[in-house]
């Protein structure tokens, strides 16, 4: 029986470890600056890194600019978006800016898109200063179903800071759905 | 066999509980305002509380102004940094400020420092208002190895809000590395 | 013995699953805009949704405008608060605003209230622009005891953005207390 108990313990340790890792999908995606759209209107950002530098993904999928949920659960979602302008980049079309981020969820089964989180600020970036910067951070806890997709929309994408420490979003599973 | 099963269950419950606690390092460090550097340039903040008020630490180490990882894993890192100025504190050398935070990771084995997250804003804190305030929040999910160190750099440290609810940073382990 | 082992495994899987779910309280509460107080002074926000749209709660209680902890543990707390003003809403009493959030903890046993996190900014919302917007995000990791209550205070509540993606707060349990 002792040997049997050891076997039970051993198999359980493996199972517990394995199931724990399998049960915890995550992603941290950083902006791919080689393909940032221009313009000042709200656009969906589709180019993100998932496997270089700080970017990583496990048990989720990145496809067509969207983070796809592979496993039902409650997830903590977050985004950090930095905007910046230097006078050497040229004159702004307007000094009154609306710098915004929208974290949206799309369900394939019911083709619909909903905003989970938004953040940002109106800014007056006057010519009196040669450099301007502003960051937004949002985060929240959401129920996500397999197949649902998370995407990021921003205003004024041409002002995005392309650094991996500046503009990113991510998710990690916290618990199963009852 | 039933007694044996109860023993297995009991030992497993202990093991599961114990391993769960051991597997979840965390820290929440609050600013130690008795030792904030002056100056307007970017500096590393080295004085933080780890055991008073809201500050706490478990299975991580705080040493030489850095939060040291003791256990490999994926962690959620966060920082909240508040800046403030009241006219009674004196005149600002410039009304055009760059209020920034940088959350950095240093690896001892490969002596190098990298910024994981940054946030902030350029601000114009004019003399027309007697009080100014601004807060930054950043957060993200990162793979950390034992021995790696997390530190906080800010610009204009003399403007930091010294309250424990205002200026703090932290981390908690979410999952093991596969 | 194999059948016994299978029974052990099976019961353990149930127990592990059940205990894991029971051990992970959470809440995501969104602003109830039908009952936002007026004024510019700091007020406690008492009207939140807990069961519609993105709002949800499990193993925590929402009562009298406060989020009540039912289970000791370490929790990650967060809040996202959006303020906005459009000229069609009327003139602001002052263009110099202090837009702030305070996440507070109240202990019933020792009747006292303490601020866990604060964030915000002073803003100059001039009449030169027809629309103004600003969002605050705060988050942190805190030890909470059963019976303790979390509440949200803001300045200028009449400027709150009433959308569920804009103004919300929440919590999820990360680990037990040792």
């Amino acid at each position: 029986i002792r040997a049997e108990k050891a076997m039970v313990d051993g198999s359980w340790l493996d199972l517990a470890k394995r199931s724990k890792l399998e049960a915890q999908p995550f992603a941290h995606l950083t902006i791919n600056a080689t393909d940032i759209p221009s313009g000042s209107h709200k656009v969906s950002l589709s180019s993100w890194y998932h496997d270089r530098g700080w970017a990583k993904i496990s048990n989720m999928t990145f496809s067509n600019g969207k983070l796809i949920v592979n496993q039902d659960g409650f997830y903590y979602l977050y985004a950090n978006i930095c905007f910046r302008h230097h006078e050497t980049s040229g004159d702004l079309a307007t000094e009154y800016l609306q710098l915004m981020v929208y974290v949206t969820k799309t369900s394939i089964k019911i083709p619909s898109s909903h905003t989970l989180m938004k953040g940002g600020s109106t800014k007056y970036w006057s010519g009196n200063s040669e450099f301007h910067f502003y960051s937004i951070n949002v985060g929240g806890f959401f129920k996500l179903r397999s197949g649902e997709e998370i995407s990021i929309e921003v205003s004024n994408p041409s002002l995005l800071d392309p650094d991996q420490d500046a503009t990113y979003f991510g998710a990690f599973k916290v618990r199963d759905i009852d | 066999i039933r007694a044996e099963k109860a023993m297995v269950d009991g030992s497993w419950l202990d093991l599961a509980k114990r391993s769960k606690l051991e597997a979840q390092p965390f820290a929440h460090l609050t600013i130690n305002a008795t030792d904030i550097p002056s100056g307007s340039h970017k500096v590393s903040l080295s004085s933080w509380y780890h055991d008073r008020g809201w500050a706490k630490i478990s299975n991580m180490t705080f040493s030489n102004g850095k939060l040291i990882v003791n256990q490999d894993g994926f962690y959620y890192l966060y920082a909240n940094i508040c800046f403030r100025h009241h006219e009674t504190s004196g005149d600002l050398a410039t009304e055009y400020l760059q209020l920034m935070v940088y959350v950095t990771k240093t690896s001892i084995k490969i002596p190098s420092s990298h910024t994981l997250m940054k946030g902030g804003s350029t601000k114009y804190w004019s003399g027309n208002s007697e009080f100014h305030f601004y807060s930054i929040n950043v957060g993200g999910f990162f793979k950390l190895r034992s021995g790696e160190e997390i530190s906080i750099e800010v610009s204009n440290p003399s403007l930091l809000d010294p309250d424990q609810d205002a200026t703090y940073f932290g981390a908690f382990k979410v999952r093991d590395i596969d | 013995i194999r059948a016994e082992k299978a029974m052990v495994d099976g019961s353990w899987l149930d127990l592990a699953k059940r205990s894991k779910l029971e051990a992970q309280p959470f809440a995501h509460l969104t602003i109830n805009a039908t009952d936002i107080p007026s004024g510019s002074h700091k007020v406690s926000l008492s009207s939140w949704y807990h069961d519609r749209g993105w709002a949800k709660i499990s193993n925590m209680t929402f009562s009298n405008g406060k989020l009540i902890v039912n289970q000791d543990g370490f929790y990650y707390l967060y809040a996202n608060i959006c303020f906005r003003h459009h000229e069609t809403s009327g003139d602001l009493a002052t263009e110099y605003l202090q837009l702030m959030v305070y996440v507070t903890k109240t202990s019933i046993k020792i009747p006292s209230s303490h601020t866990l996190m604060k964030g915000g900014s002073t803003k100059y919302w001039s009449g030169n622009s027809e629309f103004h917007f600003y969002s605050i995000n705060v988050g942190g990791f805190f030890k909470l005891r059963s019976g303790e209550e979390i509440s949200i205070e803001v300045s200028n509540p009449s400027l709150l953005d009433p959308d569920q993606d804009a103004t919300y707060f929440g919590a999820f349990k990360v680990r037990d207390i040792d």
Partner: nanobody
Framework: EVQLVESGGGLVQPGGSLRLSCAAS????????MGWFRQAPGKGREFVSF????????YYGESVKGRFTISRDNAQNPVYLQMNSLRPEDTAVYYC????????????????????WGQGTLVTVSS
């Protein structure tokens, strides 16, 4: 790497005028508080003038008050030092530096409070 570049120096007769310029590159210092100092041969670095980021506050060394004026463009770079009624004792290498403090302290006239010095520009006042 941060660089400050001073220019505008030269040879001028007593009573004449010069306008020095200090431009920053490599990082956004356009709105930092700045200071001018000078160093005559065989002497220490002497405070000349200070200006805040907005240009709203200025200070001068006793020896140049009423003759020198520090200014900055409404928009950014550079910082200027207009020198009138020049005297032979104004002969020196003139340097600009970035004030390192967030608040204006009583030590604004000390060179140790400044960073990122340029190479300097030589002003010679002689007939």
């Amino acid at each position: 790497e941060v660089q400050l570049v001073e220019s505008g120096g030269g040879l001028v007769q007593p009573g004449g005028s010069l306008r020095l310029s200090c431009a920053a590159s490599g990082r956004t210092f356009s709105r930092s508080a700045m200071g001018w100092f000078r160093q005559a041969p065989g002497k220490g670095r002497e405070f000349v003038s200070f200006i805040t980021g907005s240009g709203g506050t200025t200070y001068y060394g006793e020896s140049v008050k009423g003759r020198f004026t520090i200014s900055r463009d409404n928009a950014q770079n550079p910082v200027y030092l207009q020198m009138n009624s020049l005297r032979p004792e104004d002969t020196a290498v003139y340097y600009c530096g970035v004030y390192r403090r967030t608040y204006i302290s009583s030590t604004y006239s000390e060179s140790s409070e400044y960073d990122y010095w340029g190479q300097g520009t030589l002003v010679t006042v002689s007939s």
